[in-house]
Each structure stands twice: as C-alpha cells, then as structure tokens.
C-alpha cells in the first residue's frame, strides 16, 4: 500500500501544530518530567511485517486523537489549534485504514498484532493516569505535549522506513 504524498505532509503539519500548542515555558516544568515507558520495541522494525507496522501506527494516532479530544484538553489547550490537529489526525487515520484493508486482506488478522496494539494502549493509559494525578496542570500538559511530539516523531520515522522498504 502506498500512503499518499499528502500523508507525510500531514504528519509534519501535525507536529507543527503540537509545537504551537505550548502555553508556558517548559523550563518551569522540569520537576514534572516523567517516564511514560514508550514502547520502543513496537517501533523497531527488525521483524515487522508491514501490516503490523500499519496497525501499530493506526493505534498510535487513534490514541493521540482520543487523548487530545477530551474536555480537559479543550480546557487546557488552544481550541483553534486543536481543531486543526483533529483534522490532520483524522486524515492520517483514513489513510492508514485504507492501507490496513489492503495489507491485512484475508490472510492475516489484526488480532495477530494484539500484543503490539495493547502495548500502545497501555502507554497512553500511563499518560492519562499521569495527567489525572497531576490534576491536568499546565506543566503536566507541557510534559505530555513534549512526550507526544517525541512519540509522533518516532511514528513518522517508522513510516519513512516502511516507505524506503517498498
């Protein structure tokens, strides 16, 4: 499956929007740094089948969408930027869904990748728990924004590697 050229442009736009969501100086938030235990092994494509990688990327973007579409995120972040961000993520999801259908077909079932998808879900559960514990403070959102920017960048790198393998 060939992801459209607009897909990588959308990735870049989403990253730019995340960067623009900064509300306070991050230097004041160093005390709130946290290890969310990003599931790095799910993004190391040593033995990744393409269909598995696409499923993991889809889950990553879906969970990012869920995280930023809560009422707490709307209260903490710029709504105009959030709306633009949702549009970009929605487009990413559509692109990846088309790919999943083509790649998975009848031979493989997405259930084969359940462990990988579960690892991504647990990662986002840790992020949500952190935000809850920190009472959705400005610094907590700043730490999460930085973390999502990093994980999003790693997702983009995986997509680039998949493309170069074609």
């Amino acid at each position: 499956c060939d992801l459209p050229q607009t897909h990588s442009l959308g990735n870049r736009r989403a990253l730019i929007l995340l960067a623009q969501m900064r509300r306070i100086s991050p230097f004041s938030c160093l005390k709130d740094r946290h290890d969310f235990e990003f599931p790095q092994e799910e993004f190391d494509d040593k033995q990744f089948q393409k269909a598995q990688a696409i499923s993991v990327l889809h889950e990553m973007i879906q969970q990012t969408f869920n995280l930023f579409s809560t009422k707490d995120s709307s209260a903490a972040l710029d709504e105009t930027l959030l709306d633009e961000f949702y549009i970009e993520l929605d487009q990413q999801l559509n692109d990846l869904e088309s790919c999943v259908m083509q790649e998975v077909g009848v031979i493989e079932s997405p259930l084969m990748y359940e462990d990988s998808i579960l690892a991504v879900r647990k990662y986002f559960q840790r992020i949500t728990l952190y935000l809850t514990e920190k009472k959705y403070s400005s610094c907590a959102w700043e730490v999460v924004r930085a973390e999502i920017m990093r994980s999003f960048s790693l997702s983009i790198n995986l997509q680039k590697r998949l493309k170069s393998k074609e």
Epitope: P26, F27, S28, L30, D32, R33, F36, A146
Partner: antibody, heavy 121, light 106 residues
Amino acid sequence: EVQLVQSGAEVKKPGESLKISCKGSGYSFTSYWIGWVRQMPGKGLEWMGIIDPSDSDTAYSPSFQGQVTISADKSISTAYLQWSSLKASDTAMYYCARHPGLNWAPDFDYWGQGTLVTVSS
Amino acid sequence: DIQMTQSPSSLSASVGDRVTITCRASQSINNLNWYQQKPGKAPKLLIYWASSLQSGVPSRFSGSGSGTDFTLTISSLQPEDFATYYCQQGYDTPFTFGQGTKVEIK
C-alpha cells in the same frame, strides 16, 4: 552520528564583543535544548543557561543573566553564546551540550569539544 | 538555587580499588547526573536519573541514591578512570554542578 561542533578558540581584548557557535548534526536540532557550560582555568563546571531552538525560549543562571546572550538559528542547526563587552574574568573554556527537554531521557548526553576564550589586554 | 556538595574533593586510589563519591543536594531532587572529565576534554555523561547507566559506559560504574543523597561507585578502578567526576542536578533551573572530585593514582 550525533555531533556538536563548536567554533574555534578566540583571543580578545577587554570591552570587545564576541559570539561563539555550536552546530548540531545527526539529530533533529529542534527536538533538543542546547545548554552552555563555563569552565574557568583549573576550576569546575558552571551552568550558564539553556535554549529551546524550536522557539528560542531561554533560561539563564542568575550568575550569568544579563552578562551573556544565548540564541539559536534553527535553519542552520546552530546555537550561539555572545558577549557585548568582554572582561578578563570571562577567560574560560565554554562547552555546549544537548538536553532532551521535558522528555525522560539522558540530560547533556552529547557535548561540543569546547571553545577556549582568552580575554587579555 | 539548589546547591550540590560533593565529597571528597579529591582521593587517591589504586587500580582495582572500589571507589565511592557522594553528592548531597540542598533540597530533595529526583534527577541527578554524573559526569567524567579528563584534562583538556569535554565532560562525558556516565549516569543519568541517579542510577541509569549511559549507553557505552562500562558496567563498573553505578549510581544510587534518592532525595538529597547520591553516590557514584566505581567497582574496580581502571587506569582510564583517573579523572575528575562531577554530579549535576537536572531537577530544576538553574542546573547546578558539584565542585568535582579528582580521582588520582595512589
């Protein structure tokens, strides 16, 4: 390969201005902060300040606030440390180092080779 | 500002010795880093987040501690370990370094 390459040694007179540089390569320059550290001859390490190259936000140590200016040009992946009026006491080795920002990762994991600044009349 | 106090300021040891350097923060912190510096060279990160070994650093180096008291241990000193060691708090700005511990050959 991640590298921070600093500009060469400088010999200046008191009262002169100076701008030294630190060029990052082998990684996404805007994804990491750049910190500056001073080491006076035979002395220990002193943290001067830090910059987020993505938007040029800065933080300074109170000891260096107003004495130096930290800046960055993300288009050429370079951070700068500058003085408008040097003093003899600014004679030191200056290091730049990479910091992961708010991410949970090693602090100051890569360092430049250092720039020796000598201020003498 | 958070003050970092290292001890001892210098020590003499032999190859094979177990060496311990301590670092005390003036307030409780959760992010403590250890660096090694050799003459004429840039500092090198050894330990981050108090106890995590930086990639490529020999396992004879270890870090421990929490709150205000931290330790760097070299389990069996090697000839290349003779250098100056610095602790640094990354908990809050302004970041601050300890004054350094020089490890010399006995």
